[in-house]
């Protein structure tokens, strides 16, 4: 890019450059019009009545270098031929020369600084490509010169150009001072300013664009040539912030727009919101999950929206004296997840109506909660007890939900419970054909006992014709009708309110051979 | 000799027309720029209009603009100018003049009068 | 359009120095040209570019220009220099003439 500092074509004013020594045959403004008819100023000498060695100078008004290290100066210019001038000398020359000098004000008057080289820079000695001639009578044809020179390096404020003719016949046509700059660049979604090279070539620091974050260190650079031009060469370090995307060629970051989202640093496009989430603004980096959905604090923000499952359905109860196992179908609803888990809350509920959880001799399999098969066994329950069991399905998102979970609830009550087994039988007599047979009284849980039942057979004799049994009040009872010096198995059980108990062990007992020993007493 | 002379002054009845010619000679015409100027009785100097050596471009006073036409024949080396619709202001003595020339570019031209012609007198009267 | 204002006359006595004045906004910025004029003749070029002086105008006439003022110096004045001056610009469109109104020059005795 090039930035003027002074275009002579552009200028609608006169020019009034300062011309030294003040005599005849000095430089002159004239103006005149361009190929698009515009007023345009140019500079004329021809001076061949000058003695040798003289020069004219032509000075610009002072130029502020804005910056700029290093000037270009384009001159467009037509030289007349020595040849063709009438009353050309041998001192005509088809040459000029151009200075500079710097300042950092506009000091310079019509003596100051001195006319000559030092404190002028000479910038270079220009000849020019192509000559007009002129025959007399006709007009002067010739084509334009075009040349342009550098300045630098400059370090003051701003500066003059002068132009020294030594007699030369010449129009200066326009004088362009411009500069070069690596005009402001947005490439890969980084920023870099305006930029005027001082040397060779310069780094310039980017920045990321508005909502792009930088991804990398340092920050992006890229290199500014002396030409303007910027060093060709792969910029990356940024990327578009979340809830915005690359557009327009990686030149901005557009907001995602409403329904849409993108959750990271990135240069991925923005995205639809996932199921059951919605963006209602633009540059959303998430979709917000809709009334009653969720996400897990583990779910990513790309994931679906999902709600706690419903209620387990079709629960059933096995109970086994104090083992209860319950086994239910999974929820209808899962909610959109796979973490599914259930969880079995007990309560003991009173004839009055009033519940309190279950008591902690209860144990649970696997376990009361995180149960990932649709069953748990349940141990220790009392008898006689009404228990209210609920199975809730859960998710990773029911802890968000506002509310108790659903459940499927099911009422259970246990037996009363019976007598224990009665142990500890004694044959407190035996005869040759009938036992008399005491036990210890059980402590039955829910009432008193009420009666006794005797099951006994001879051994030996296992199938269930030989098996006979006797009902007594007490803790006694005589078996008679036994087989001489044979050997019975008995067992006893009690029964209360709430029914049987168990048989005890099986107690061996042996009747007596002859008379003489009945009724001896014996201990079990 | 380099010099300018005008002709076709004369008086003329509001609303009519009259044209004015300058002769030059001594000097490249068609090199030149050229202009008309006017002078009222015991006034000042009023530039009317200008013409560039090769009537690529005209310009005009606003007070002529649209009345006035400026021209010129190179190959007689003589500039006109064509009056309309005069009124009794424009009585004044008429003078063609040169613009300073460039010594070799007539698309060029210096921004004084350096050649006067000697004047010619136009009367609106009716 | 710019508009330049000189004052209608000027008395000199011979020998002396006459100025006569021609402003305008800016007056420096533009170059001015000043024409002599004298009673039934054509108008002459006596100064252009402000300062610089055509070949046959004697070496007392002078110009300069700075500021919101140009000026015409006639050092020594003589009985011939009496006449009208007239100084004269170009306006910015570089195409229209612009002449200010006129200094009447009178050299006493």
């Known amino acids: 890019l090039e930035e003027t500092l002074l275009n002579t074509k552009l200028e609608t004013a006169d020019l009034k450059w300062v011309t030294y020594p003040q005599a005849e045959g000095q430089w002159e403004e004239l103006s005149g019009l361009d190929e698009e008819q515009h007023s345009v100023r140019t500079y004329e000498v021809c001076d061949m009545k000058r003695p040798g060695g003289q020069a004219h100078w032509l000075r610009t008004g002072w130029v502020p270098r804005r910056g700029a290290v290093h000037v270009y100066a384009t001159i467009r210019f037509t030289m007349m031929e020595c040849l063709s001038l009438p009353r050309a000398s041998r001192s005509c020359k088809e040459t000029f020369t151009v200075f500079y000098y710097e300042s950092e004000a506009d000091t310079a008057t019509a003596h100051t600084p001195a006319w000559m080289e030092n404190p002028y820079i000479k910038v270079d000695t220009v000849a020019a490509e192509h000559l007009t001639r002129k025959r007399p009578g006709a007009e002067a044809t010739g084509k334009v010169n075009i040349k342009t020179l550098r300045l630098g390096p400059l370090s003051k404020a701003g500066f003059y150009l002068a132009f020294q003719d030594q007699g030369a016949c010449m129009a200066l046509l326009s004088l362009h001072l411009f500069y070069k700059k690596c005009s402001w660049l947005i490439t890969n979604l980084t920023y870099f300013p305006e930029t005027v090279p001082r040397e060779l070539v310069v780094p310039v620091a980017g920045s990321c664009v508005a909502n792009a974050v930088p991804t990398a260190n340092p920050s992006p650079s890229l290199y500014c040539r002396e030409d303007g031009q910027w060093a060709e060469q792969q910029v990356t370090g940024c990327s578009c912030a979340p809830g915005y995307e690359a557009a327009e060629s990686n030149k901005v970051c557009r907001a995602c727009g409403q329904g849409t989202f993108k959750p990271q640093i990135g240069d991925e496009s923005c995205l639809p919101c996932p199921a059951n989430s919605h963006s209602n603004n633009i540059g959303s980096p998430v979709c917000l999950c809709r009334i009653g959905y969720y996400r897990a604090r583990s779910d990513p923000r790309s994931s679906p929206c999902t709600t706690p499952p419903s209620a387990p359905r079709s629960v059933v109860h096995h109970l086994n004296g104090s083992t209860l196992r319950l086994e239910w179908s999974a929820p209808l609803e899962s909610g959109g997840r796979e973490d599914l888990t259930y969880a079995v809350r007990c309560r003991e509920c009173r004839p009055g109506g009033s519940c309190l959880p279950c008591g902690g001799d209860m144990t649970f399999d696997p376990g009361p909660r995180d149960l990932v098969e649709p069953w748990v066994a349940i141990r220790g329950l009392r008898p006689d007890v009404t228990y209210t069991f609920e199975v809730a399905a859960l998710n990773g998102v029911s802890t968000l939900a506002t509310g108790p979970p659903p459940f499927e609830p099911v009422n259970v009550t246990t037996d009363r419970e019976v007598p224990p087994a009665v142990s500890d039988i004694r044959v407190t007599r035996s005869s040759p054909s009938s036992l008399i047979l005491s036990w210890a009284i059980p402590r039955a849980p829910s009432g008193a006992v009420l009666d006794y039942e005797v099951k006994y057979h001879e051994k030996g004799a296992e199938g269930p014709s030989s098996v006979r049994f006797l009902k007594t009040s007490e803790n006694r009872a005589e078996l008679r009708g036994l087989k001489r010096g044979a050997s019975y198995l008995v067992q006893v059980r009690a029964r209360s309110e709430a029914g049987y108990g168990p048989f005890g062990q099986e107690h061996h007992s042996q009747t007596q051979l002859d008379e003489s020993e009945s009724w001896r007493e014996q201990l079990a | 000799q380099v010099q300018l002379v005008e002709s076709g002054g004369g008086l003329v009845q509001p609303g009519g027309s009259l044209r004015l010619s300058c002769a030059a000679s001594?000097?490249?015409?068609?090199?030149?720029?050229m202009s008309w100027v006017r002078q009222a009785p015991g006034k000042g100097l009023e530039w009317v209009s200008n013409?560039?050596?090769?009537?690529?471009?005209?310009h005009y006073a606003d007070s002529v603009k649209g009345r006035f036409t400026i021209s010129r024949d190179n190959s007689k080396n003589t500039l006109y100018l064509q009056m309309n619709s005069l009124r009794a202001e424009d009585t004044a003595v008429y003078y063609c003049?040169?613009?300073?020339?460039?010594?070799?570019?007539?698309?060029?031209?210096?921004?004084?009068?350096?050649?006067w012609g000697q004047g010619t007198l136009v009367t609106v009267s009716s | 359009d710019i508009e330049l204002t000189q004052p209608p006359s000027v008395s000199v006595a011979p020998g002396q120095t006459a100025r006569i004045s021609c402003s305008g906004d800016?007056?420096?910025?533009?170059?001015v040209h000043w024409y002599q004029q004298k009673p039934g003749q054509a108008p002459v070029l006596v100064i252009y570019?402000?300062?610089k002086r055509p070949s046959g105008i004697p070496e007392r006439f002078s110009g300069s220009n700075s500021g919101n003022t140009a000026t015409l110096t006639i050092s020594g004045t003589q009985a011939e220099d009496e006449a009208d001056y007239y100084c004269s610009a170009w306006t910015t469109t570089m195409m229209h003439i612009v002449f200010g109104g006129g200094t009447k020059l009178t050299v006493l005795g």
């Open positions: 570019y402000d300062s």
């Open positions: 013409i560039t050596s090769s009537s690529s471009m005209t």
């Open positions: 001594g000097f490249t015409f068609n090199n030149s720029w």
């Open positions: 003049a040169r613009k300073g020339m460039s010594f070799y570019n007539n698309k060029y031209a210096k921004s004084m009068f350096d050649l």
């Open positions: 800016n007056l420096g910025k533009k170059y």
